[in-house]
């Protein structure tokens, strides 16, 4: 960068080098150039020579002010015009930042993904900050007292192997930058709590000549645990609003459900489970997508190994029974 | 050999416009930072808007006097600087010149037009 | 903006004369200062650059010297056509700043 460069002299920022975005800010450069009085000194910022707010304070050093700086990161360098030189000589550069203090974290949600052999820790981390900040996530065994911290930028994943301390942890964590430091409240945490089952996946979709026609949904999880909660929400592709079905599964075969449906309609539905009384859901599935027949033919959609939403074939289909609807999102 | 043709003034009445061009040659247009420096009968230089030099990404500047009133502008293409003047008042009567600048002094100045704001 | 003041406003001399112009800067210019002539109805000319370097084409009798906020321009020996205004112009600081004009007469 900019700070690798020779330099001739000195440039500094004032406050500092990584401000508060918005901050009127001073940029100094000072010359010690041999056989050199500077007759002019020019700041430039990411190449383009700045015109306006220069101030010279001393023989050697001048100042650039600027209002309500907002810009993240900017390349700054300064040059003087020295007598007798034809072409400006460099002084020195610095890359300056700004951007804000982290927000408190909140919403910490810790859980593992079944056969994931990880424990994965997520936050909400508030405001973009625009600068470097880290996450240190402390994890606490509520039984041996003892703390491990585990460094990251984003979200972090803990391998089960090593929380040995038992099953019940405190899990907070604490957002540091240059420009500030805050924590999060303490989540508490059982191992045993906090399982998702392994995903569940639709994999065809069939619609059975009938009286009234029925199309039949196939979905399937690799899940050991045995009482799992499950939701299947389904609708028109042109609907807003989905109708939520709810099931209690057992995973030792494909699951089949049945819904009677409008004809010559697309239809778009997923799949989300939960271990029966716990807290957290899988992510709904990958949207599954089944037109209707016009009339009785049958009709069979299969899911392909691959991301089924950019595929369009493969489909999902929904009841028009009396089902409650409902308009949760993800 | 620098060049520097001004047209477009004459008189006009206070509150109308004006525009008046600068017509360059001999020099490297881009690289040059381009004003327009005004002259009141009898009376001493005045500085009153500035385009800068590529290098400077062609900054404006403007005097108080004329802020918000005056607008300068380069056509690189045509070598050519203009100064749009809105809502003239007796007071902007004067010779306007043309002027070149590389380093921040004027090197060279055009011959100026009158530009005269009466009713 | 940095002020700079001329003086005299005007003086009478005569050919042949020594003639002494000097400009004040309202801070430290670090010779960043030019002088221009300017006659009756023409544009202003460049005479001196960074307060002692003389422009090409201009007579070797006009001269600058100065530094700190103090700058002089000397006509070491007047001529029938140096009769004219003369303007200095600081460009330390931006924006550049005029004085307000020496008018040097015929006595």
């Known amino acids: 960068g900019i700070t690798n460069i020779n330099c001739s002299g000195h440039i500094w920022v004032e406050p500092a080098t990584i401000f508060k975005m918005g901050m009127n800010i001073s940029i100094y450069c000072q010359a010690a150039i041999k056989n050199c009085q500077p007759r002019k000194l020019h700041f430039y910022k990411n190449g383009i020579k700045e015109r306006f707010q220069i101030t010279r304070i001393n023989k050697t050093t001048a100042r650039l002010w600027y209002k309500n700086f907002l810009e993240p990161h900017a390349s700054m360098y300064c040059t003087a015009e020295c007598p007798k030189h034809f072409q400006e000589t460099l002084i020195c550069g610095k890359d300056i930042s700004s951007g804000y203090p982290p927000d408190i974290p909140d919403e910490v949600t810790c859980v593992i993904y079944e056969y994931s052999g990880n424990m994965t820790c997520t936050w909400n981390a508030g405001k973009l900050t625009y600068i470097d900040t880290k996450y240190v996530v402390h994890v606490k065994s509520l039984e041996t007292e003892e703390e491990q911290q585990y460094l990251t930028s984003s979200y972090i994943n803990i391998s089960t192997d090593s929380l040995q301390g038992g099953k019940k942890y405190l899990v907070w964590v604490q957002a540091a930058n240059a420009l500030g430091m805050e924590e999060s409240k303490q989540l508490q945490i059982h191992l045993d709590d906090i399982v998702i089952p392994s995903a569940a996946v639709i994999s065809r979709a069939e619609t059975i000549n009938a009286t009234v026609p029925k199309t039949i949904i196939y979905w399937d999880s690799q899940t050991t645990i045995e009482k799992v909660s499950c939701e299947m929400r389904y609708k028109a592709t042109t609907n807003q609003t989905w109708n939520v079905k709810e099931f209690d599964t057992n995973f030792t075969y494909v699951q089949q459900s049945e819904f009677y449906l409008e004809p010559n309609i697309k239809y778009v539905f997923q799949v989300r489970c939960q271990e029966t009384g716990k807290r957290y859901w899988q992510p709904w599935s990958s949207p599954f997508f089944h037109k209707t027949p016009e009339t009785v033919p049958q009709v069979t959609s299969k899911a392909f190994q691959h991301d089924t939403w950019n595929s369009g074939l493969t489909v999902a289909s929904i009841s028009t029974g009396h089902l409650t609807s409902d308009n949760r999102g993800d | 050999q620098v060049q520097l043709v001004e047209s477009g003034g004459g008189v006009v009445q206070p509150g109308r416009s004006l525009r008046l061009s600068c017509a360059a040659s001999g020099f490297d247009f881009n690289s040059y930072g381009m004003s327009w420096v005004r002259q009141a009968p009898g009376k001493g230089l005045d500085l009153v808007a500035d385009i800068n030099s590529k290098s400077y990404n062609y900054a404006t500047y403007y005097a108080d006097s004329v802020k918000d009133r005056f607008t300068i502008s380069r056509d690189n293409s045509k070598n050519t600087l203009y100064l749009q003047m809105n809502s003239l008042r007796a007071e902007d009567t004067a010779v306007y010149y043309c002027?070149?600048?590389?380093?921040?002094?004027?090197?060279?100045w055009g011959q100026g037009t009158l530009v005269t704001v009466s009713s | 903006d940095i002020q700079m003041t001329q003086s005299p406003s005007s003086l009478s001399a005569s050919v042949g004369d020594r003639v002494t112009i000097t400009c004040r800067a309202s801070q430290d210019i670090y010779t960043n200062l030019a002088w221009y002539q300017q006659k009756p109805g023409k544009a202003p000319k460049l005479l001196i650059y960074?307060?002692?370097s003389l422009q090409s084409g201009v007579p070797s009798r006009f001269s600058g010297s100065g530094s700190g906020t103090d700058y002089t321009l000397t006509i070491s020996s007047l001529q029938p056509e140096d009769f004219a205004t003369y303007y200095c112009l600081q460009d330390s600081e931006y924006p550049p700043t005029f004085g307000q004009g020496t008018k040097v007469e015929i006595k």
């Open positions: 002027a070149v600048h590389h380093s921040d002094y004027f090197e060279y």
């Open positions: 960074h307060a002692s």
